[in-house]
Amino acid sequence: APFDDDDKIVGGYNCEENSVPYQVSLNSGYHFCGGSLINEQWVVSAGHCYKSRIQVRLGEHNIEVLEGNEQFINAAKIIRHPQYDRKTLNNDIMLIKLSSRAVINARVSTISLPTAPPATGTKCLISGWGNTASSGADYPDELQCLDAPVLSQAKCEASYPGKITSNMFCVGFLEGGKDSCQGDSGGPVVCNGQLQGVVSWGDGCAQKNKPGVYTKVYNYVKWIKNTIAANS
């Protein structure tokens, strides 16, 4: 493996318990994707995380243990973006309506949608229960966190020639070693208190010159608001 440190997310750290109160786990008998609570009844995730039946788990830290702060709520509606493209992963975004309202408290709360696009160099928080090994597999029980900067669109496109659309952006480190990975999909990229990204894809994980690629939430604010209004 190119990086032999005690990998978390890959190269991150154990989040402080319930310090990411908007983070949710999507469960279909097991955790398969992350998501972000954007209001009491709606979650944003990745389009490629679509399944016909999903249980949304809020207030989680250790997904293998009932710790007392969890809220398990079934999805009532699962709405993938109408222009989602499974080949290019363009428009990789999805909305989930909860069958009942989440109880908002110190350990379960919402994250704001962006008011401006992500600025190059901005430090963001990426979180999830995905693979913590850049090679092989090591799935954590506890939520992992990673602080990482937004990369310029030029560097992003240079890393993945011909594959980056205007609905995608890169976050991470070109030197490798720190990245999101399998199991983090759909999870949040939060910059300055706003949900700027959704974990989407990458070539491998934490590889040199292959940063993580994220759905640019800013481009979908209108769609999110319209969809919520039409399904309330």
């Epitope: 990745a46 490629h48 293998e64 799935y139 594959k163 199991g183 894809w201």
Partner: antibody, heavy 128, light 108 residues
Framework: QVQLVQSGAEVKKPGASVKVSCKAS????????MHWVRQAPGQGLEWMGS????????NYAQKFQGRVTMTRDTSISTAYMELSRLRSDDTAVYYC?????????????????????WGQGTTVTVSS | EIVMTQSPATLSVSPGERATLSCRAS??????LAWYQQKPGQAPRLLIY???TRATGIPARFSGSGSGTEFTLTISSLQSEDFAVYYC??????????FGGGTKVEIK
């Protein structure tokens, strides 16, 4: 059709090396992990290691560390497993197997790994 | 290293009967578990992945269940072609990838 075709049976003397090849066809070779598994006569399956054909990065089981080398030639979609300093207890059938999880342009959903395609096996006999 | 333990080592069953094979992990592997069937002189064949998802072309009589540390492969009504050795394998934490020791399903 997706398949893995391995090289033929080998008979080696103790202390020698053996190199087994595994030619992939019907899919993008660089997109998937390739693993090597062996099975001694009458025994179970034993994982030896894997190679990422895109990067060439390898993972080896500790038991084989220092004795095994996994390589690939992307131009001919072939993976290789070389085992050195052979002993009689290395007598086994050696298999290559593909993990269907994409390495390139991979979605970061939790993957469901498995060995979906196996080579036919290569019998390696180590005898003096 | 995660140790996978299969039981029983040998299962004697009559054709048409139900067979239940067990696989236990030394620590949680979530749902990152696969089952294989191997017949003499042949390479293993993937039956189940993700603990419960049947691989392409696998008959519905094969089903997998469980998560965490306890897993089961059930063959609802054994056919003559089902007599073979079955292996479980975890993908939750590797290297190393680890297999169970196998369960031989033989004709009673």
């Amino acid at each position: 059709q997706v398949q893995l075709v391995q090289s033929g049976a080998e008979v080696k003397k103790p202390g020698a090396s053996v190199k087994v090849s595994c030619k992939a066809s019907g899919y993008t070779f660089t997109g998937y992990y390739m693993h090597w598994v062996r099975q001694a006569p009458g025994q179970g399956l034993e994982w030896m290691g894997s190679i990422n054909p895109s990067s060439g990065g390898t993972n080896y089981a500790q038991k084989f560390q220092g004795r095994v080398t996994m390589t690939r030639d992307t131009s001919i979609s072939t993976a290789y497993m070389e085992l050195s300093r052979l002993r009689s207890d290395d007598t086994a059938v050696y298999y290559c197997a593909r993990d269907p999880v994409l390495l390139l342009r991979q979605q970061r959903i939790l993957h469901e790994s498995a060995f979906d395609i196996w080579g036919q096996g290569t019998t390696v006999t180590v005898s003096s | 290293e995660i140790v996978m333990t299969q039981s029983p080592a040998t299962l004697s069953v009559s054709p048409g009967e139900r067979a239940t094979l067990s696989c236990r992990a030394s620590q949680s592997v979530g749902s990152n578990l696969a089952w294989y069937q191997q017949k003499p002189g042949q390479a293993p064949r993937l039956l189940i992945y993700g603990a419960s998802t049947r691989a392409t072309g696998i008959p519905a009589r094969f089903s997998g269940s469980g998560s965490g540390t306890e897993f089961t492969l059930t063959i609802s009504s054994l056919q003559s072609e089902d007599f073979a050795v079955y292996y479980c394998q975890q993908f939750h934490n590797w290297p190393p990838l680890t297999f169970g020791g196998g369960t031989k399903v033989e004709i009673k």
